[in-house]
């Protein structure tokens, strides 16, 4: 089939006092090959500090996955989710408060 870009959605939740868990979800993409990674200051975080979900079919002939990490509250502006899919890439910031952002990729 043809390439379908992912929808990327970043959310945050309180983990423990002073820390938050940020989760980056990519969904509705095809083919299944994707790179999803959290970055600090534009630098990819170490493997050990991130948790990844499997790339799974979502029932519509496309796929979904996620990556999460724990960060210090107040440092959110330093962190972005980086996505690469079929030659396109995008970065996605941590939303402020309890809101969330989602949008398709851009170059």
């Amino acid at each position: 089939g043809s390439t379908v870009p992912p929808m990327v959605n970043v959310t945050r939740s309180e983990a423990s006092e002073g820390n938050i868990t940020v989760t980056c979800r990519a969904s509705g993409f095809y083919p299944w090959n994707i790179t999803l990674s959290w970055r600090q200051d534009g630098v990819s975080l170490s493997h050990d500090t991130q948790q990844w979900g499997d790339v799974l079919p979502d029932g519509n002939g496309t796929y979904q996955t996620w990556v999460a990490t724990r960060i210090c509250q107040g440092e959110e502006q330093r962190f972005t989710c980086y996505m690469e899919h079929s030659g396109n890439h995008s970065t996605h910031p941590v939303p402020s408060g309890n809101s969330h952002h989602h949008h398709h990729h851009h170059h």
Epitope: S37, Q40, D41, G42, V43, S44, S46, D48, Q77
Partner: antibody, heavy 116, light 107 residues
């Protein structure tokens, strides 16, 4: 993207070393981390630290007590200051951009000798 | 700090030869391994990032592979312009560290 280091080639022991990295072709506030690395005689490379696009800094713990990286966003430059230098700080100093996994663009380097 | 051991420290090969340089970390670096080329004039260029991804503009004769603690850079058909020193770098565990370099010469 181009990076160019500049600064004095000779510094006296106990003084401070100050270098400038001039960046063209990309804004240092746009994204990524802007690094200083040094190469000692004999080729060993050591990462010194970086200033991120937000202005946050991260340093090598081995140098943290002596190093400061700052920037001038209006000139698209960032700076290295290394205090209390000794002859062991004699090296070629490079600036580089760290994009995601790797340092994808480097300056040509500037040689610094610490000697009285 | 993670120690990166590069072998050999130098090598001499004929034009057209296949050349392999190895880099070993003293702990798992989860594919966060990059290769750089430093020309005799001191200019440094990124060749390979994240173990096997080729940086834009790098000739396809360069390739990277590996996992865990052991990684390698291969030059498929050595050319005169490949005379340089090659460095590996791990980016998984701060502070980032480099190998000692491999000097490549032509026989």
């Amino acid at each position: 993207v181009q990076l160019q280091e500049s600064g004095p080639g000779l510094v006296k022991p106990s003084q401070s070393l100050s270098l400038t990295c001039n960046v063209t072709g990309y804004s240092i506030t746009g994204d990524y981390a802007w690094n200083w690395i040094r190469q000692f005689p004999g080729n060993k490379l050591e990462w010194i630290g970086y200033i991120g696009y937000t202005g946050s800094t991260t340093y090598n713990p081995s140098l943290k007590s002596r190093v400061s990286i700052t920037r001038d966003t209006s000139k698209n430059q960032f700076f290295l200051q290394l205090n209390s230098v000794t002859p062991e700080d004699t090296a070629t100093y490079y600036c580089a951009r760290w994009r995601n996994w790797a340092m994808d663009y480097w300056g040509l380097g500037t040689s610094v000798t610490v000697s009285s | 700090d993670i120690q990166m051991t590069q072998t050999p420290s130098s090598l001499s090969a004929s034009l057209g030869d296949r050349v392999t340089i190895s880099c070993r970390a003293n702990q798992d670096i989860s594919h966060y391994l990059n290769w750089y080329q430093q020309k005799p004039d001191g200019a440094v260029k990124l060749l390979i990032y994240y173990t096997s991804r080729i940086h834009s503009g790098v000739p396809s004769r360069f390739s990277g592979s590996g996992s865990g603690t052991d990684y390698s850079l291969t030059i498929a058909n050595l050319e005169q312009e490949d005379v340089a020193t090659y460095f590996c770098q791990q980016g998984n565990t701060p502070p980032t560290t480099f190998g000692g370099g491999t000097k490549v010469e032509i026989k």
